[in-house]
Amino acid sequence: LMGGQDKPFLSARPSTVVPRGGHVALQCHYRRGFNNFMLYKEDRSHVPIFHGRIFQESFIMGPVTPAHAGTYRCRGSRPHSLTGWSAPSNPLVIMVTGNHRKPSLLAHPGPLLKSGETVILQCWSDVMFEHFFLHREGISEDPSRLVGQIHDGVSKANFSIGPLMPVLAGTYRCYGSVPHSPYQLSAPSDPLDIVITGLYEKPSLSAQPGPTVQAGENVTLSCSSWSSYDIYHLSREGEAHERRLRAVPKVNRTFQADFPLGPATHGGTYRCFGSFRALPCVWSNSSDPLLVSVTGNPSSSWPSPTEPSSKSGICRHLH
């Protein structure tokens, strides 16, 4: 990862993708340490702040403007050389977001996938973006970039992710850029959580008072396992939203979560999954499906006292 013998390594924390008004720390790593360094911007725009200035260990840039977007290099201090400075570092591209309307991001076949499968993340917009960028939250590497394809007044790009492994699970966002301003990106798409299942043993799912209930009777679904899952996720076939609850250790040494569904109005097929706090987007195998049937007066909906989570937020910790 580090540069060659006389070449420093320039990196950005937390990410090279920075929202307008945000801050980013640029680090110039040279000869096994962070020493004094100078910064350069390749297109020479917006650099009065760098002229003749020497930075120590890191440079905090911000609040950033579109003019900060571009390619940066650093030179490390080398007192005994002719120039006093190293060769230029690797180029580091800083992308500034929030400059155009956000695109949309969709997952095909869906955001809940088995380990080893491939998912297509499609980023699209009615803004004629030349390039689309896909970025996973918490990753400092550059985002993936694709040329936008334009059809019927819509520009789009299909990012293929896979075969899926735990390291690829997480929250994705995409951005677009217009011609002539390749590093001035749009606002981020709404976040999309990619969840990988099938990594751990399946929990068991049961219904109280039972899987067949009278209309209006209160139903609770219990998800439990001997594995010390931190969180359980309950999904209902045909519903986009999952519900989640913290697992509670029980006296019989199992870990359980009880999902109150409220008064029964109509049935459905339910599954639950377990996950650990450290990897909130990596889930267990699915429990066996549980068919809940309602006898009596069927209705078109089942009220939910536990608020379903939004389409994103699965990969955030439950506090």
Partner: antibody, heavy 118, light 107 residues
Framework: QIQLVQSGSELKKPGASVKVSCKAS????????MQWVQKSPGQGLEWIGW????????KYAEDFKGRFAFSLDTSVSTAYLQISSLKAEDTAVYFC???????????WGQGTTVTVSS | DIVMTQSPSFLSASVGDRVTITCKAS??????VAWYQQKPGQPPKLLIY???TRHTGVPDRFSGSGSGTDYTLTISSVQAEDVAVYYC?????????FGGGTKVEIK
């Protein structure tokens, strides 16, 4: 939302020390720095210096070198300004403000009044 | 150190007036100028940086312009809530320095 919350007012005797805290929330503390600004009675704003919250490296304005010291506790997202050997002319409101190497101070604490009087 | 000379030090305007505050730097500061608003009993608030970039949530009646050594903050239609002291600041080289402030009052 981004917030900087400073410690309360202090009344000190000449020669004593004071430590002002500034607790940050709503952003990743180590991706920005903390600037410190003094506003003396009847005077304008004067920059004391700043500390890079990523590297921990402080930088002081010439007039504030010696008795003024910055520190950080990144585990609690807090920056500190310590003033030692207090003098009557240190009586002022001290502000912390988020900012980096570019010197723009985009969010400010509410200010801490330090009064030095015998 | 770069000296920022701000004028006027005080101005009185009617609601709806266009208000202009100027700041002159003792040397070229390459558009690295910020403007702050400080209302009574409150900390300063960033309005503008890099001469003309409005900070998040700042109404578009506030605008900035300038280059070299001369910079201007304009309030296109002053409102009662704009009563405050306004400061310019150069962020070109350390020590960062502020202007002496302009107190804006509503008639």
């Amino acid at each position: 939302q981004i917030q900087l919350v400073q410690s309360g007012s202090e009344l000190k005797k000449p020669g004593a020390s004071v430590k002002v805290s500034c607790k940050a929330s709503g952003y990743t503390f180590t991706t920005a720095g903390m600037q410190w600004v003094q506003k003396s009675p009847g005077q304008g704003l004067e920059w004391i210096g700043w500390i890079n919250s990523h590297s921990g490296v402080p930088k002081y304005a010439e007039d504030f070198k010696g008795r003024f010291a910055f520190s950080l506790d990144t585990s609690v997202s807090t920056a500190y300004l310590q003033i030692s050997s207090l003098k009557a002319e240190d009586t002022a409101v001290y502000f912390c403000a988020r900012g980096g190497d570019e010197g723009v101070m985009d969010y400010w604490g509410q200010g801490t009044t330090v009064t030095v009087s015998s | 150190d770069i000296v920022m000379t701000q004028s006027p030090s005080f101005l009185s305007a009617s609601v709806g007036d266009r208000v202009t505050i100027t700041c002159k730097a003792s040397q070229d500061v390459s558009t690295a100028v910020a403007w702050y608003q400080q209302k009574p009993g409150q900390p300063p608030k960033l309005l503008i940086y890099w001469t003309s970039t409005r900070h998040t949530g700042v109404p578009d009646r506030f605008s900035g312009s300038g280059s070299g050594t001369d910079y201007t903050l304009t309030i296109s239609s002053v409102q009662a809530e704009d009563v405050a002291v306004y400061y310019c600041q150069q962020h070109y080289s350390t020590p960062w320095t502020f202007g002496g402030g302009t107190k804006v009052e509503i008639k």
